[in-house]
Interface confidence: low
């Protein structure tokens, strides 16, 4: 009779994490007598997966009834597969011996590859806010996937980004992998409502990629534009001066009125109006008693926005002339509209 052969017909088996793997093995003869054992890996460090003779293997079931005398099918099923189960599995025939059974013949091995879904991508932005025209970096991380092949894309408001670098670790063989990507995004003034999306596509996701998002409202700072104007007289000796603070984000803003360099009043932006682009407008007014001043008054509206250096705009109030509507006169430390950052 021909010598027994152990046949593992599948060179490799691919299984999704959480599913059951079937590892096939058949023998060509009933002789010699002895048990079958399954191992992961070869050599002295191999791991016992199943022993027909003894032991408790809760995740393993046999495909056929191994107690039947004429059984030559030693295939097994391993349930609830995880990436840690990946490896090469060997079906090994032992010959009955005393005191121990002796290894007789091994199959060629079946490589079990586990398809594990990537974790939901986590997108994180810079620690500090940045102003429009700054380039900021966003990172995206996803873990625990297998096989290694994966596609990552970045989008800003549906438009695909091209300036990013992606690494998949580890470089060599592993039971599962992680991806890390850094994208550079140039902020624009309209980005308060914008979103950055990291999209991960993997064979396990069946064409339905995972997405992680970051709202640029957490990242952007739009500096305010200031305009100081003098309103018509409210009373014979009173002039109303307003400071319009426009198109800023976030809302955190403190305004200080200075009269000839001396602090007159400080207030925090509270009842703001929101523009359609997500930025805010706010107006503060100062009632100036002209009769209390002998000389011309320099009124300065000084704004500290989101902890940044103060910007200010000034208005010269002529007290010598009869108080009436005057144009906006701007002698300021920071002049011009503050709508586009230039760093």
């Amino acid at each position: 009779e021909e010598e027994l052969q152990v046949i593992q017909p599948d060179k490799s088996v691919l299984v999704a994490a959480g599913e059951t793997a079937t590892l096939r093995c058949t023998a060509t003869s009933l002789i010699p007598v002895g048990p079958i054992q399954w191992f992961r890996g070869a050599g002295p460090g191999r791991e016992l997966i199943y022993n027909q003779k003894e032991g408790h293997f809760p995740r393993v079931t046999t495909v056929s009834d191994l107690t039947k005398r004429n059984n030559m099918d030693f295939s097994i099923r391993i349930g609830n597969i995880t990436p840690a189960d990946a490896g090469t599995y060997y079906c090994v025939k032992f010959r009955k011996g005393s005191p121990d059974d002796v290894e007789f013949k091994s199959g060629a091995g079946t490589e079990l590859s586990v398809r594990a879904k990537p974790s939901a991508p986590v997108v994180s932005g810079p620690a500090a806010r940045a102003t429009p025209q700054h380039t900021v970096s966003f990172t995206c991380e996803s873990h625990g996937f297998s096989p290694r092949d994966i596609t990552l894309k970045w989008f800003k408001n549906g438009n695909e980004l091209s300036d990013f670098q992606t690494n998949v670790d580890p470089v060599g063989e592993s039971v599962s992998y992680s991806i890390h990507s850094t994208a550079k995004v140039v902020l624009t003034r309209e980005d308060v409502h914008s979103q950055v999306i990291c999209e991960v596509a993997h064979v396990t996701l069946q064409g339905d990629p995972l997405r992680g998002t970051a709202n640029l409202s957490e990242t952007i700072r739009v500096p305010p534009t200031l305009e100081v104007t003098q309103q018509p007289v409210r009373a014979e000796n009173q002039v109303n001066v307003t400071c319009q603070v426009r198109k800023f984000y976030p809302q955190r803003l403190q305004l200080t009125w200075l009269e000839n360099g001396n602090v007159s009043r400080t207030e925090t932006a509270s009842t703001v109006t929101e523009n359609k682009d997500g930025t805010y407008n706010w107006m503060s007014w100062l009632l100036v008693n002209v009769s209390a001043h002998r000389d011309d008054v320099k009124l300065t509206c000084q704004v500290e926005h989101d902890g940044q250096p103060a910007v200010s705009k000034s208005h010269d109030l002529k007290v010598s002339a009869h108080p009436k509507e005057q144009g906006s006169n701007t002698a300021a430390e920071n002049t011009g509209s503050n709508e586009r950052n230039i760093y």
Epitope: V311, N334, I342
Partner: antibody, heavy 131, light 103 residues
């Protein structure tokens, strides 16, 4: 608003030219200024831009074709902007237009740049580089 | 880079749209009647019209595409239309120009 360019004419290859734009009709120091040129039978090409703001991280910018050869400067007192272009070649032949932007920059921010915000053009001065 | 069509044509009275695509947030539109003549600004900062420019010229932006719309095209509108913007280094860029032919 008027922008009057001068300094064009026949130039020698390898030589240098200096174009001056005299501006009037607006508060010159508050606006970004630039130079745009047009080679014969070609489109518009950005040459250089200069911005307001004393310490802006952005003070001058240059087109790729003139980078390293051009210098743009402004004199707010005289309301002039000057373009110096060295090592002239035949590809520098064309009409050079002075441009005014719709706004300017502070030390921290801009409300206008150059090519997206031009609101006034000069009539142009012709430069011919030939031996 | 800035991309715009090489040419467009329209009958008098029609509406014509000229597109310009790039990566910038802001665009300007400039008209040149003949090569070498001074361009005229039609639109700056996407949608702002200088004084003296008729309201039939308008600009709009959607995504990375900017559009110049001319309603009620006239024979006098025949010209080359350029769009301009800035790259991320603030260097100006102009499109190659779109020739408008009024049929």
């Amino acid at each position: 608003v008027t922008l009057d360019e001068s300094g064009g004419g026949l130039q020698t290859p390898g030589g240098a030219l200096s174009l001056v734009c005299k501006a009037s009709g607006f508060t010159f120091s508050s606006y970004n200024m630039g130079w745009v040129r047009q080679a014969p039978d070609k489109g518009l090409e950005f040459v250089a831009g200069i911005y307001t703001g004393s310490d802006a991280g952005l003070s001058t910018t240059y087109g790729a074709a003139v980078q390293g050869r051009a210098t743009i400067s402004r004199d707010n007192g005289q309301s002039t902007v000057r373009l110096q272009l060295n090592n002239l070649g035949a590809e520098d032949t064309g009409i050079y237009f002075c441009t005014k932007s719709a706004g300017g920059c502070s030390d921290y921010n801009c409300d206008a740049y150059i090519a997206d915000s031009i609101d006034a053009w000069g009539h142009g001065t012709e430069v011919i580089v030939s031996s | 880079a800035v991309t715009q069509p090489a040419s467009v044509s329209a009958n008098p009275g029609e509406t014509v749209k000229i597109t310009c695509s790039g990566s910038s947030s802001y665009y300007g539109w400039y008209r040149q009647k003949s090569p070498g003549s001074a361009p005229v600004t039609l639109i700056y900062d996407n949608d702002k019209r200088p004084s003296g420019i008729p309201s039939r010229f308008s600009g709009s932006k959607s995504g990375s595409t900017n559009t110049l719309t001319i309603t009620g095209v006239q024979a006098d509108d025949e010209a080359v239309y350029y769009c301009g913007n800035e790259d991320n280094s603030y260097v100006g860029i102009f499109g190659a120009g779109t020739t408008l032919t009024v049929l």
